[in-house]
């Protein structure tokens, strides 16, 4: 099963609109690249509950992107 076929994004579907802040361990942002032409916001959940994709158009995602960009630049 080719997991990372060229042109495949990491997230399937539009993503969740929000995640409880208390459940978030970390947030990662994947910017558009050759593999995926859209921004992806990946939330790692606490207590080994896996990861979820956050809808990049959601209010929470926009806040996270802003926060990360402020920190990085």
């Amino acid at each position: 099963f080719p997991m990372f076929k060229r042109g495949r994004c990491l997230c399937i579907g539009p993503g969740v609109k929000a995640v409880k802040v208390a459940d978030i361990e970390k947030a990662s942002i994947m910017y558009p690249s050759n593999n995926c032409d859209k921004i992806e916001v990946i939330i790692t959940l606490k207590e080994n509950k896996g990861q979820r994709c956050l809808n990049p158009k959601s209010k929470q995602a926009r806040l996270i992107i802003k926060k990360v960009e402020r920190k990085n630049f």
Epitope: C9, C11, I12, G13, P14, G15, V16, I43, G50, C53
Partner: nanobody, 126 residues
Framework: EVQLVESGGGLVQAGGSLRLSCAAS????????IGWFRQAPGKEREGVSL????????YYADSVKGRFTISSDNAKNTVYLQMNSLKPEDTAVYYC???????????????????WGQGTQVTVSS
């Protein structure tokens, strides 16, 4: 209330075809990825196929590639699994499940799915 209802299972001879349906209510397909899983007696639940209705992308387990086709009808809020060239090893209870925010890495991880149907039995005789 969110509900997934499977139908279309039955008894079929090896080489035959079946079309399973998964009717969703309480949410719109565009917001979720819908996957088909199956579980044979004494075996773990395994992923078969998945569709993301918002962009139409589809995924298949190696064991069913070229034989099964997943599709969706957003107007009917229903996902279909067309199963051709069925083999006795396809015998199982087939479940549909809905996931939001799913990652490719977690494609066939049942715990990452939010809602499940009650299942429909598929029996393939030799």
């Amino acid at each position: 209330e969110v509900q997934l209802v499977e139908s279309g299972g039955g008894l079929v001879q090896a080489g035959g075809s079946l079309r399973l349906s998964c009717a969703a209510s309480g949410f719109t397909l565009n917001d979720y990825a819908i996957g088909w899983f199956r579980q044979a007696p004494g075996k773990e639940r395994e992923g078969v196929s998945l569709i993301s209705s918002d962009d139409g992308s589809t995924y298949y387990a190696d064991s069913v590639k070229g034989r099964f086709t997943i599709s969706s009808d957003n107007a009917k809020n229903t996902v279909y699994l067309q199963m051709n060239s069925l083999k006795p090893e396809d015998t199982a209870v087939y479940y549909c499940a809905a996931a939001q925010g799913l990652l490719l890495l977690s494609l066939w991880v049942p715990t990452q799915y939010d809602y499940w149907g009650q299942g429909t039995q598929v029996t393939v005789s030799s």
